[in-house]
């Protein structure tokens, strides 16, 4: 056969399907690889083709589009399977062809089983909630264009394995679940699930988030530098150690990139000849803020060193701020009898 | 500890209503929701309906569909069946079962019954 | 609806021996699927839930299994308190709906 551009295994598209589901999975040529839609590509005479490789097989082979009660269809730009079962599992291929023209992806698609508490080793999506902010809410997600609109589906939220019924701060609305105030408390697992029927059958989509509360952009503040500070000096003598750590504590920020860096003469350790190593630490509290500590290090400090600038320097989104740490060379305690000697006026 | 309770229940004449009654105790009611599932004599259990914890949904079996309505008042810790249209096949004992809370939806606790007796 | 079939229709054992109901979906239902024992002029006892977990209370010689569309609950043991009739029921639908029973007999 011809030439066909092959874009390979797009793993990026993990796709997870729980078994026992509808799944309707539209092929990725049109969403990341070529520069017009299927519409487009239909009307041009292009002509799309599924085929799959079976979980731990090579050989690649047609999809059964007949089997019984149309299992798994093909419409327009998506594979539909309703439902899915386990040896679904394996490495799907859309490929746009005619006479002249050919270009290909496969994507890995797993099933996967759950229990009846919905656990199970799908990779859960995480919504990050700010504590104490209002009401807030989240949507049930990938439910659209199963059904139509004159379906109207019955929706259950559950949080872990327990449906939500009269939670204190948590209203099922529909497709919506609303958290009044989201406490520390409501972090957890929550799953919808929506039932519908078609054709005579009943079908289920289930769909787990994991909801992280976090701090509240209200309570937001720039990084705030706790170590070095003006109670601490670093006294050294030549040749010994100098450990220094730069805390900083940063407020949680939705996609903020916290940064900490040491300037040494303001030039970064990097750009200077001195042998100095740091070392990092992150922690994290209960709502995500965060407290970086970079520990710079130098084995063997010398008198010059101890003449340097050192200073901390911290960023996020709310702003920069730097403090410098007091370093000072050790007096050396003077020899006792060259005391006694000055003291009396010896020369 | 958990209890449901039916009342209501006695002979009627087809084509007249009847309402029965389960009143809930031993448990917070309106975290729950309840369903009415009937036993006709010597036969199996057929599902009735079932209300949400809080009323906002309500589904039927098809047999029933149109003639029965589920309510309930959580002030009260009451759940009802209004049937109206009655025939002579809905005779039957009804329980309320309370649905335990978890996906599978389980009838953790029974009431033990009301006869309805549809006769001319 | 759901069409729930169970098998036997009835059913005679004797003391100590191991026994099973098996129920069929007409679709797959998962395995929001549970079991119940009724005797006469009571009400019905839950006994399995989910497919296969056993509810509080319930001795273990009782054992569910199964997905999608056919399960099986087993009597390891047969005990004499145990002669009653079973139940299975389908709780994937919002219309929910019953096996139509099995009757477990002393031989």
């Known amino acids: 056969s011809e030439r066909c551009d092959d874009w390979g295994l797009d793993t990026m598209r993990q796709i997870q399907v729980f078994e026992d589901e509808p799944a309707r999975i539209k092929c990725p040529l049109f969403e990341h690889f070529l520069k017009f839609n299927y519409s487009t590509a239909h009307s041009a005479g292009l002509t799309l083709i599924w085929y799959w490789t079976r979980q731990d097989r090579d050989l690649e082979e047609p999809i059964n589009f007949r089997l019984p009660e149309n299992r798994i269809s093909k419409e327009k730009d998506v594979l539909w399977f309703r439902p899915t079962l386990l040896n679904d599992t394996g490495n799907y291929t859309c490929m746009l062809r005619n006479t002249t023209y050919c270009s290909k992806v496969a994507f890995p698609l797993e099933v996967v089983q759950k229990d009846s508490c919905f656990n199970s080793p799908m990779k859960l999506p995480v919504h990050k909630l700010y504590i104490e902010y209002g009401i807030q809410r989240i949507t049930c997600p990938n439910v659209d264009g199963y059904f139509p609109s004159s379906v109207k589906p019955t929706i259950t939220w559950y949080m872990g394995c327990y449906k939500i019924q009269n939670f204190n701060n948590v209203i099922p609305e529909g497709m919506n679940l609303s958290f009044l105030i989201a406490l520390i408390s409501n972090n957890g697992n929550y799953t919808c699930v929506v039932t519908y029927p078609e054709n005579g059958r009943t079908f289920h989509l289930t769909r787990t988030l994991t909801v992280k509360v976090v701090g509240s952009p209200k309570n937001a503040v720039p990084p705030v530098i706790h170590s070095p500070n003006d109670h601490v000096v670093y006294e050294k003598e030549p040749g010994e150690e100098l450990l220094i750590p730069c805390t900083v504590y940063f407020s949680f920020l939705m996609d903020s990139r916290n940064e900490v860096w040491w300037t040494i003469d303001g030039k970064k350790p990097d750009d200077i000849t001195i042998d100095v190593t740091i070392n990092e630490s992150i922690s994290h509290s209960r709502t995500e803020d965060e407290t970086r500590t970079q520990i710079l290090s130098i084995k063997k400090v010398t008198s010059e060193d101890l003449k340097r600038s050192y200073v901390c320097h911290a960023r996020s989104a709310k702003g920069e701020v730097a403090k410098a740490a007091k370093v000072k060379q050790k007096v050396p305690a003077p020899r006792y009898t060259v005391e006694l000697a000055c003291g009396f006026g010896a020369t | 500890q958990v209890q449901l309770v039916e009342s209501g229940g006695g002979v009627v004449q087809p084509g007249r209503s009847l309402r029965l009654s389960c009143a809930a105790s031993?448990?917070?009611?309106?975290?729950?929701?309840i369903h009415w599932v009937r036993q006709a004599p010597g036969k199996g259990l057929e599902w009735v309906a079932v209300?949400?914890?809080?009323?906002?949904?309500?589904f039927y079996a098809d047999s029933v569909k149109g003639r029965f309505t589920i309510s309930r008042d959580n002030s009260k810790n009451t759940l009802y069946l209004q049937m109206n249209s009655l025939r002579v096949e809905d005779t039957a004992v009804y329980y309320c079962?309370?649905?335990?809370?978890?996906?599978?939806?389980?009838?953790?606790?029974w009431g033990q019954g009301t006869l309805v007796t549809v006769s001319s | 609806d759901i069409q729930m079939t169970q098998s036997p229709s009835s059913l005679s054992a004797s003391v100590g021996d191991r026994v099973a109901i098996t129920c069929r979906a007409s679709q797959s239902i998962a395995s929001y699927l549970n079991w119940y024992q009724q005797k006469p002029g009571k009400a019905p006892k839950l006994l399995i839930y989910g497919a296969s977990s056993l509810q509080n209370g319930v001795p273990s010689r009782f054992s569910g299994s199964g997905s999608r569309t056919d399960f099986t609950l087993t009597i390891s043991s047969l005990q004499p308190e145990d002669f009653a009739t079973y139940y299975c029921q389908q709780s994937y639908s919002t219309e929910i709906t019953f096996g139509q029973g099995t009757r477990l007999e002393i031989k």
């Open positions: 209300i949400w914890y809080d009323g906002s949904n309500k």
């Open positions: 031993g448990f917070t009611f309106r975290n729950y929701g």
């Open positions: 079962a309370r649905e335990e809370g978890i996906a599978v939806a389980p009838f953790d606790y």
